[in-house]
Structures are given as C-alpha cells and as structure tokens.
C-alpha cells in the first residue's frame, strides 16, 4: 500500500540534490584554496541534518547551526554586495570585481543557489514531489529558513560602505518583502556600517530617468536613515557598459557617466 504523502504547492526537491550539493562543495573548495580544509561529506551531513525527518513547515535557524559552523569563512566586511531581483548582473559583477562578494560567492550561498529541498516528518526520505511554498503553505520551510539565516548573518557581517544592486525595471525597485528588504536591511549594524550605496540598474537603453528619485528608493532611504546609516544612490544607465568598464577601467569611454 503506497504511503500517503503531503502534497505541497511548491516544486519538489531539485533532482540529484545530494549529489549536487556534494559536487558544488568539492568544486568550491578546489577553486578557493582557503577552504580546501573543508570536509564536504561533513558539510552534506550537516545540510541534510537540518531538514531530513523534520516537518518542512517547522524548520528553525537553529536547525542550520551545524551547517553554519562548517561554513565559517573570511569575508572582507567592506566588500559586500547585496542584490535584489537582479542576481545575474550582481554575480557577473563579482566575477569581474573579484575582491567583492555576494552571498552566493561564499561556500554556503554557492551550495544552495537556485536549489529547492525539503524532507518529510519522521522519515529519512527527501521529497522530490513537492515542497512548501512560502506564500501558499508556510514560511518556515527549509529553503526560506536557510536563506533567511545566511542572509541575516551576511548582513550582520557587513561594515563601512555596503553596496546593493537593485533592478530599475521592476515596478517596486525596492521591495520591502524581498530578502533584501525584509532581512538584510534590518540586520546591517549601524555601529559598523557607515553607508548603504544603492546601484539602480536601468533596463531600457533610452531610459535616462533618475530612478534614484523613485518613491520606493525614497522609502529605502527613509528606513536606512532611521537606522543611523547614511544612504547614497547611483543610476547605472548602461549595465553592459558598466560591466565593461569594471573589466577595463582604463578605457577612455569609462570616464563618462554609465
């Protein structure tokens, strides 16, 4: 008799999830010599232990604590790049500007990027059929709690000038309900962080508006100012040229506004 299985509203665990996490860990430790001491089997065991045999709507930050310990890493606190709804460009930027880090440039972020996972209460099985959706099912699911935990810790670690890349093509350039708006903004430490500098990325080639005047950016400025952190904002009118100029800053066309 087939066992009854909870049907959730979200997609199930990414196929070959254990193999993917393990392979990513091995690859990361090979690329980053300072992490070569990491035991990837222990990392996988800690990751698995955070959600296996637990109800996927009852996951806590504490469940991920063993994984956090194994992911200990040096991140220059003044070289942190946050992003919201514009992940690809943020990652392209840090691939060129190698001294800056997004969360996904760390081991823990790299392991989980774009993956979905969940288990089932009282069984050691991974659920490949469905996982809880944050809105339709529950917020304390394995994926959401993981990203909330590492995002909070990443923001807490930041200092001096923190940069955030925002998508100027969206109706809400700053969205209070995004991970950046709901977690990271509120966990920047005013005693360590002097300024939050927003980079608003324009989508249209002919878009010359000053999106730093957008009402949602003004809302972000208000939230940040109330936390005793200074705020600044820059328009990136030409993201393609922006990346090109990061690669080749000596280029004569890079002195003009981008």
């Amino acid at each position: 008799v087939p066992r009854w299985r909870q049907q959730w509203s979200g997609p199930g665990t990414t196929k070959r999830f254990p193999e993917t996490v393990l392979a990513r860990c091995v690859k990361y430790t090979e690329i980053h010599p300072e992490m070569r001491h990491v035991d990837c089997q222990s990392v996988w065991d800690a990751f698995k232990g955070a959600f296996i045999s637990k109800h996927p709507c009852n996951i806590t930050e504490e469940d991920y604590q063993p994984l956090m310990k194994l992911g200990t890493q040096t991140v220059p606190c003044n070289k942190i790049l946050l992003w919201s709804r514009i992940k690809d460009l943020a990652h392209q930027f840090t691939q060129v500007q190698r001294d800056m880090f997004t969360l996904e440039d760390t081991l823990l972020g790299y392991l989980a990027d774009d993956l979905t996972w969940c288990g089932e209460f009282n069984t050691s099985k991974i659920n490949y059929q469905s996982c809880p959706d944050w809105r339709k099912d529950c917020s304390n699911n394995p994926v959401s709690v993981f990203w909330k935990t590492v995002s909070r810790r990443f923001a807490e670690a930041a200092c001096d000038v923190v940069h955030v890349m925002l998508n100027g093509s969206r109706s809400k350039i700053f969205d209070k309900n995004s991970t950046f708006g709901s977690v990271e903004v509120h966990n920047l430490q005013p005693e360590k962080v002097q300024t939050l500098e927003a980079w608003v990325i324009h989508g249209g080639r002919e878009d010359s508006r000053d999106l730093c005047q957008d009402p949602t950016i003004k809302e972000l400025e208000s939230i940040i100012s109330k936390r005793n952190i200074q705020f600044s904002c820059k328009n990136i009118y030409r993201p393609d040229k922006f990346l090109q100029c990061v690669k080749n800053p000596e280029d004569s066309s890079c002195t003009s506004e981008i």
Epitope: L70, T72, Q73, T74, N78, T106, R153, A157, E191, K192
Partner: nanobody, 117 residues
Framework: EVQVLESGGGLVQPGGSLRLSCAAS????????MSWVRQAPGKGLEWVST????????DYADSVKGRFTISRDNSKNTLYLQLNSLRAEDTAVYYC??????????RGQGTLVTVSS
C-alpha cells in the same frame, strides 16, 4: 571602527592551559555577539566558540567542547577564551571577531598558541 587586540598566546605542553584575551574598541561591545576563530598552519579558518552580547549564551565547536570556555567582561570590553587540556591539534593563531559567523572579517593580528612537548 571595530578594533580588537588579542593576547595571551604562547608555547605550552600538551595537557597544559592558557587564557586568551581580546580587548575590543570602536563599538558598543555589549551589543555584539563575539567569537573566537582559529587558523592552524597551512589550514583554513575554523570557528571555535561564540558568546552572546550579554554573555548568557555560549556555543562551542565539537573539537573543543568541554576543554575551552568562552567568557566576556562587558565593563572592560574584553573577551576571553580559557584553553584547558591542550592538544597538539590546538596549535593555531587564535583571532577574536565580532559577530556569530559564519562570515568573519577578523581585524586583529591574532595570538599564536603552540602546543608542543
């Protein structure tokens, strides 16, 4: 600006003890969890222990549990790590850092602990 200065390291025989100190400045010390991390020669960064801002909550790596004790004196802006029953594998540079990790940017020079007979 967050600044820390670690001290108290040295050469000690296996089974011996040391007390490390970390003097912190540039921030409201009691508002921040603080951690000890270490780096053994030729190895990566390893988290050792964390203590909450008020000192009421502590956590330890399995490898040091029962042997090391973290504490703090908020009136002196100082963090401590008592190292007992030291082993050769505890040989490392010990750093204190603000926060609970896993992302650390240690600001001090660290203090070297060498366990050898």
């Amino acid at each position: 600006e967050v600044q820390v200065l670690e001290s108290g390291g040295g050469l000690v025989q296996p089974g011996g003890s040391l007390r490390l100190s970390c003097a912190a400045s540039g921030f409201t010390f009691s508002n921040f969890a603080m951690s000890w991390v270490r780096q053994a020669p030729g190895k990566g960064l390893e988290w050792v222990s964390t203590i909450s801002g008020g000192g009421g909550s502590t956590d330890y790596a399995d490898s040091v549990k029962g042997r090391f004790t973290i504490s703090r004196d908020n009136s002196k802006n100082t963090l401590y790590l008592q190292l007992n029953s030291l082993r050769a594998e505890d040989t490392a540079v010990y750093y204190c850092a603000d926060g609970r990790g896993p992302f650390f940017d240690y600001r001090g020079q660290g203090t070297l602990v060498t366990v050898s007979s």
